[in-house]
Interface confidence: low
Amino acid sequence: DTHKSEVAHRFKDLGEEHFKGLVLVAFSQYLQQCPFEEHVKLVNEVTEFAKTCVADESAENCDKSLHTLFGDKLCTVATLRETYGEMADCCAKQEPERNECFLQHKDDNPNLPPLVRPEVDVMCTAFHDNEATFLKKYLYEVARRHPYFYAPELLFFAARYKAAFAECCQAADKAACLLPKLDELRDEGKASSAKQRLKCASLQKFGDRAFKAWAVARLSQKFPKAEFAEVSKLVTDLTKVHTECCHGDLLECADDRADLAKYMCENQDSISSKLKECCDKPLLEKSHCLAEVENDEMPADLPSLAADYVESKDVCKNYAEAKDVFLGMFLYEYARRHPDYSVMLLLRLAKAYEATLEKCCAAADPHECYAKVFDEFQPLVEEPQNLVKQNCELFEQLGEYKFQNALLVRYTKKVPQVSTPTLVEVSRNLGKVGAKCCKLPEAKRMPCAEDYLSVVLNRLCVLHEKTPVSEKVTKCCTESLVNRRPCFSALELDEAYVPKAFNAETFTFHADMCTLSEKEKQVKKQTALVELVKHKPKATKEQLKGVMDNFAAFVEKCCKADDKEACFAEEGPKFVAASQAALA
C-alpha cells in the first residue's frame, strides 16, 4: 500500500521512541566515526521534520523517499571528507546509488577504542541524571561498532540495558546486581551481531535464493507441524525483513518485523505449539522470543521421504516443472524430519540432491540413475558428525583455553598470511564452540556446533575481504556459502608460505602483563603463540607446548618478583633464546 509520505507512515507505525532509536542506529551504522552529539542533532532534525509530515503529508519534501531524506541529512555533515575520505564521494551520487555507496563503506572493523566500563556508581549517576541520553549513547556505541547489527533487536537490547540499570542502581550491592547483567548483554550482543552479519553476507554475497534456502531449512526444523505453504509465507516475509535491515532500511525492517510477529501470533495453530508464551509479551520481547523459539515436536506420522523423492517415477517431471519449489519442498520435508542436523548440512544435502537430478534427469534411465541418491548423503552426514565428535573429545580433554590454543595452531598453519589479531579473535571464538555445544545432548550438538562455526567463519571472511591476503581464504569464503566450514576444515599446512622472520620485539613483555585481566593475559599469550607458528609453521605440538609452558612459567615468575620490570628485562631475552633453540 502506498503512502503520500513514507516518513510520516513509518513515524506513525513505529511511534516516536522507536523511530528516533532506529534513525540513530541507522546514522551511527553509516557514519561510524561521527561524535555522539552530531548524531543526536541529526536525529532530532529528522524527527522534527517527520512530525511536520505527520501533521501534513503534503508538506514540502514529505513525499521524498527515506533514502533521499536520510542521505541528504548525512551529507550535511561538515567534516565528511576529512573524517571519511572517499566516502564523501557518495554524496555526489543520486539515489539509489548513493545509499549503495554508503553501504559499501560500512566498516566491519572500525578503528574505535574498546569500550571501557566505568565504575558502577559513575554509570548509575549518569543513568539517573539523564536516562534518555544514557540509552541513546548505548545505541550509538553498539551501532557504530557493529554496522550490521539487527536494528529492531538492538532496541530490545537497549530495553534490557535500561531495565538492568533501573533495577540494579537501587540495589544494596549495585555491582553484584549489575555487572553479571552487563556481561550477559555484552556476550549476547556480540553473538547477535555475528549471527546477523552472516544473514547479511548470505543476502549480499550469495543472493536471496541462498537466504531463502537457509530460512526454509531453519523454519522447517522449528515448525515441523506447519505446512509447506505456511513455511513458504514465513520465509518470504522473513527474507523481506532481513533484506531491508541489511540494506539500511531500518524503519521498514522494524515495521515489517512487527507485522511478521503479529501474523505469527494470529496464526499459531498452523505454525507451532511453542509460540504461545512469546505472544503474550510486548513487541520487542515478543519478536526476540519468536526468533529464538525452540523447535516444535515433529509430527508422529511423517511418511518416508523416499516415496516422493526417489521411488516415484515422476521425480524428474516434478523437478523439471518447477525446480525451486520442488527443491524447496524437498528441503522442507528433510529439515522437518531432522532437527538433529545443522542447517548447513541440510543445505548441502539439498545441493547434492539437486546435482543428482540435474545429472540423472538427462540420463537414459533417470530412475535407475537417481535410485541410490540417499546413499550418497551418508558421507555428507558423517563428516560433520565425526568433526563434532573429535573436537568435543579434544575440548573435554583440554579445557577451553588449551582447546583455543589447539585451534590457533591449526588455523595459523592453514592460513598463516592472515593477520595475528584476526587469527586470535577468530580462533578464540571457534574455541568457544566447546563450552557452547559439547555439553548438549547428541541430537543438539551438530546443529549447535556447525551453525555456530558458520557464524564465526563468516567473521573471518568479512575481515579478510577488507584486507585480502590469502587466496585460500578468498576461495573458501566465496565459492560456496554452505561449504565454507568443510572448505576450511580441509585446508592443510600451507607449504608455499615463507616463514616470518623472527622479531624479538614481538616476544618482549613488560610488567604491565601482571595487571591484565585473565582474558587479556590469554590474548597476549595466544598472540605470541600465533607469532611462533608464523615463525616456525612446521613446529610440532610438543615443541609449541614446551615453549608455551615456559612462557607461562616465565610470566608467573616475573609477576611474583619484587622488581617485576627488572625481571621481565632479564628473563625475557633468556626465554626468547630458549624458545628459538627449542624450535630450531
Epitope: 509447506f228 516434478n318 516443472e321 519449489v325 520442488f326 519442498m329
Partner: nanobody, 115 residues
C-alpha cells in the same frame, strides 16, 4: 507465498458424488504437476491422484481408479477432483498438493460418506 485452498467437501450418502476444488496462488500453477492426497482419521496420508502441468497425463491410486477423475483449469489456477460412487472408506480430509507428494500442504476439506 504458496497458498492452496480446498473446497467442495461435505456429507454424502454411499454411491453419491462430490466435486472438490483447489484454488492455488503464489506460484505459476500451469508449470506444476498437482496431486490430491487424503488422510482418514487415525491413519497416515494416502496419495489419491496426480495430474501433469498440462492436464494430459493423469494417475490414480488403485482404490479410486474408475470412480475419481482429476482435472485442472490453468486459466483459473484451479485443480478439481470429481468423486463418483463414493464409499464409506473414502471418508477423509482431502488435500491438494504440489507435485506428487504425500505430504499435506494446506488445511484440506472434509469428505464424509455415511448413510
Amino acid at each position: 507465498q504458496v497458498q492452496l485452498q480446498e473446497s467442495g467437501g461435505g456429507l454424502v450418502q454411499p454411491g453419491g458424488s462430490l466435486r472438490l476444488s483447489c484454488a492455488a496462488s503464489g506460484f505459476t500453477f500451469g508449470s506444476f504437476g498437482m496431486s490430491w492426497v487424503r488422510q482418514a482419521p487415525g491413519k497416515g496420508p494416502e496419495w489419491v491422484s496426480a495430474i501433469d502441468s498440462g492436464g494430459a497425463d493423469t494417475r490414480y491410486a488403485e482404490s479410486v481408479k474408475g470412480r475419481f477423475t482429476i482435472s485442472r483449469d490453468n486459466a483459473k489456477s484451479t485443480l478439481y477432483l470429481q468423486m463418483n460412487s463414493l464409499k464409506p472408506e473414502d471418508t477423509a480430509v482431502y488435500y491438494c498438493t504440489i507435485g506428487r507428494s504425500s505430504s499435506r500442504g494446506s488445511q484440506g476439506t472434509q469428505v464424509t460418506v455415511s448413510s
